[in-house]
Amino acid sequence: LVPHLGDREKRDSVCPQGKYIHPQNNSICCTKCHKGTYLYNDCPGPGQDTDCRECESGSFTASENHLRHCLSCSKCRKEMGQVEISSCTVDRDTVCGCRKNQYRHYWSENLFQCFNCSLCLNGTVHLSCQEKQNTVCTCHAGFFLRENECVSCSNCKKSLECTKLCLPQIENVKGTEDSGTT
């Protein structure tokens, strides 16, 4: 089975690397535009230059291409807590990240939100906070992990997962209650 190629891939594969097939004349291979530029006009003939123009402010191309327009620079999303790590240039998109002591949580492939790293209060750090992962905490005795926070076993309801971790405490509470009855 031959893998299905899109029209653009089909056209490009006929020409050597760094060149593309002229859209109106498939016997001509034009040189692709360098990163930071876009295709203004196809080359008029074999061995002749492709007319490439530099991307305007607010746009970029990050690799060699034959795009008719540069790509718009991304904006860091303030509402998601993002900050600009490096600004957009003609050949590189904006790089967004998080502040110190924060991590990225990806809601989807290209959308992340910044959250504060857990401090593991009433516990110890099992794994340090990473760029894309929160701190992993281990809780002290008498505490259980809920949404990556160490919560007192006094907040453990019998139906919750914490019952195994808090079993001694629950038994004690039950015992105290029982001893108070007549």
Partner: nanobody
Framework: EVQLLESGGGLVQPGGSLRLSCAAS????????MVWVRQAPGKGLEWVSH????????YYADSVKGRFTISRDNSKNTLYLQMNSLRAEDTAVYYC????????????WGQGTLVTVSS
Amino acid sequence: EVQLLESGGGLVQPGGSLRLSCAASGFTFAHEPMVWVRQAPGKGLEWVSHIDRVGQDAYYADSVKGRFTISRDNSKNTLYLQMNSLRAEDTAVYYCAILPKRGPRFDYWGQGTLVTVSS
């Protein structure tokens, strides 16, 4: 008590339109960025769109870009999702939620409204 109540779902043919609303109460609506997420049958939650506090800046998932428009009316404490050129793959329960602050979980979201796209 925070309450989010979605409405506007229903059965629509492919190519059709719907406008979802989310009535908010129990918090200062104008202070919170808001989110639409959806859950297709047998699938996980998918982020659809979100909008900043003042309604100036919006984000759209690639799957809905150019077809859906998120908006808000802070004077009416209401969030909207205008859905055009609907496709079968848009069939899902749509939820509105407050953008999480403390961690990657939705503390406040509605009961959802079902959108079914079918001929």
